[in-house]
Interface confidence: low
């Protein structure tokens, strides 16, 4: 959780002098309760907005809006504490509106907004607005909370934000997998416009089984700028294992902002059609039994060799 760096947030408006301050989420009025405290916010609304940073990056932000109740307690309203809690991490970030002048009338309904909390795709937040000072112990609560779910990167507007784009939302590798002679697969995919490496994980399975019988990891070094958006062709040599005929090719990019967590794309080659009367299979060890070796991936040895080149 963080705050937008630009432009500087403003809470002052006609008839009110106000400044926005960072907050520890522990207002002084918790520790030193006051006798008279304001009523709670009214009509708290949270919407998804989008904002550019000073560098021009586009981020999703929580647009927080609320109004004041039309009662006399505004005479005791000294400000507000805005808190955003990310529910899956319990991380909390707060800011404080500090009123530098008193509110003395309701000629028009007082309305406040804040759009500087940067939020993440596919995350849920609890947004709370506390009027200050906070209530005395056992006093009526003077805050309002709402949950806010940020859409994931499938959302048309989210897709073009910096966090989504950097996790690969715009990358369409358009994978093709072709079976060649001599137990080989040719994998072709489109490189993205970033000098970052890729990994291809080939996982093979017996027909109608979910235990892998062959796994092979292939590393593709970072392309040069002139290779961006070009097709990369990789030839993978398969282990000639009986019945190990269904192959899943998964491509994992390592874009700078998502590192190990980038969106992966995959393609599958099915087993060839089985003949009506299958030939008897000789006795053999289970194909998925691990073999000794230094690789993290079973059966990932010299027989799973590969080579690649970029096609312009």
């Amino acid at each position: 959780l963080r705050l937008l760096d630009f432009p500087a947030p403003v809470c002052a408006q006609e008839g009110l002098s106000c400044r926005v301050k960072n907050s520890t989420c522990l207002d002084d009025s918790w520790i030193h309760p006051r006798n008279l405290t304001p009523s709670s916010p009214k009509d708290l609304q949270i919407q998804l907005h989008f904002a550019h940073t000073q560098q021009g990056d586009l981020f999703p932000v929580a647009h927080i809006e609320w109004t004041l109740q039309t009662d006399a307690s505004i005479l005791y309203l000294e400000g507000a504490e805005l808190s955003v809690l990310q529910l899956n991490t319990n991380e909390r970030l707060c800011v404080r509106f500090e009123f530098l002048s008193k509110l003395r009338h309701h000629h028009r309904r007082w309305r406040f907004t804040f759009s500087h909390f940067v939020v993440d795709p596919d995350q849920e937040y609890e947004v709370t607005v506390h009027h200050l000072p906070k209530p005395i112990p056992d006093g009526d609560p003077n805050h309002q909370s709402k949950n806010f779910l940020v859409p994931d990167c499938e959302h048309a507007r989210m897709k073009v934000t910096t966090p989504c784009m950097s996790s690969g939302s715009l990358w369409d590798p358009n994978i093709t997998v072709e079976t060649l002679e001599a137990h080989q697969l040719r994998v072709s995919f489109t490189l993205w416009n970033e000098s970052t490496h890729y990994q291809i994980l080939l996982t093979s399975f017996p027909h109608m089984e979910n235990h892998s019988c062959f796994e092979h990891m292939h590393h593709i070094p970072a392309p040069r700028p002139e290779e961006f958006h070009q097709r990369s062709n990789v030839t993978l040599t398969l282990r000639n294992l009986k019945g190990c005929c269904r192959h899943q090719v998964q491509i994992q990019p390592f874009f700078s902002s998502c590192l190990n967590d980038c969106l992966r794309h995959s393609a599958t080659v099915s087993c060839p059609e089985m003949p009506d009367t299958p030939e008897p299979i000789p006795d053999y060890m289970p194909l998925w039994e691990p073999r000794s070796g230094s690789s993290d991936y079973k059966d990932d040895d010299d027989k799973g060799s590969s080579h690649h080149h970029h096609h312009h």
Partner: antibody
Framework: QVQLVQSGAEVKKPGASVKVSCKAS????????ISWVRQAPGQGLEWMGW????????NYAQKLQGRVTMTTDTSTSTAYMELRSLRSDDTAVYYC?????????WGQGTLVTVSS | EIVMTQSPATLSVSPGERATLSCRAS??????LAWFQQKPGQAPRPLIY???TRATGVPARFSGSGSGTDFTLTISSLQSEDFAVYYC?????????FGGGTKVEIK
């Protein structure tokens, strides 16, 4: 091919709960969220909520908040929708659908009848 | 919430004719709009997403247009299998909302 297969029809008494399942196949379950939509007899479609199969995040329709719970079991690629404190106006066909925003594949629907 | 209004409620068209269905949003939904077709006893079938992109396997006679608040689904030449109820749905903001539907019936 992508398929969403839902559990069978249910008849419930007012005040009871119902749990509808939706088993997905033909794609990587955790890649797309599951949404739930219901349709009362002779009426239009009503969005109930969504669950992220990856993070478990949920978003429920305001009117169902507190009565509905959506969950997933990634080991079986199954999504569940539980609705509690059933009322007669909850009588509807309940659909699961793939994706968070627009729905590209739908289950066949589960008729839930609430009657005393 | 964003209210989606479809018109007309019922459209009577002869086979081979052109059908134009309208969907209006109470506020702008950009191009985040989908159209579905539903026949009695069946689940809805996706036709269009992002206002104008045809879903997989949808015939070219179906086309979507519009952005902001006004959207149109056009069926250029109605086939017998096209008589059904059509729903629009916005996914620009929570909660997701559907229109009330337009029933396309044989004239």
């Amino acid at each position: 091919q992508v398929q969403l297969v839902q559990s069978g029809a249910e008849v419930k008494k007012p005040g009871a709960s119902v749990k509808v399942s939706c088993k997905a196949s033909g794609y990587t379950f955790t890649r797309y969220g599951i949404s739930w939509v219901r349709q009362a007899p002779g009426q239009g479609l009503e969005w109930m909520g969504w669950i992220s199969t990856y993070s478990g995040n949920t978003n429920y329709a305001q009117k169902l908040q507190g009565r509905v719970t959506m969950t997933t079991d990634t080991s079986t690629s199954t999504a569940y929708m539980e609705l509690r404190s059933l009322r007669s106006d909850d009588t509807a066909v309940y659909y699961c659908a793939r994706r968070q925003l627009y729905f590209d594949y739908w289950g066949q629907g589960t008729l839930v009848t609430v009657s005393s | 919430e964003i209210v989606m209004t479809q018109s007309p409620a019922t459209l009577s068209v002869s086979p081979g004719e052109r059908a134009t269905l309208s969907c209006r949003a109470s506020q702008s939904v950009s191009s985040n709009l989908a159209w579905f077709q539903q026949k009695p006893g069946q689940a809805p079938r996706p036709l269009i997403y992002d206002a104008s992109t045809r879903a997989t396997g949808v015939p070219a006679r179906f086309s979507g247009s519009g952005s902001g608040t006004d959207f149109t689904l056009t069926i250029s030449s109605l086939q017998s299998e096209d008589f059904a109820v059509y729903y629009c749905q916005q996914y620009d903001n929570w909660p997701l909302t559907f229109g009330g539907g337009t029933k396309v019936e044989i004239k």
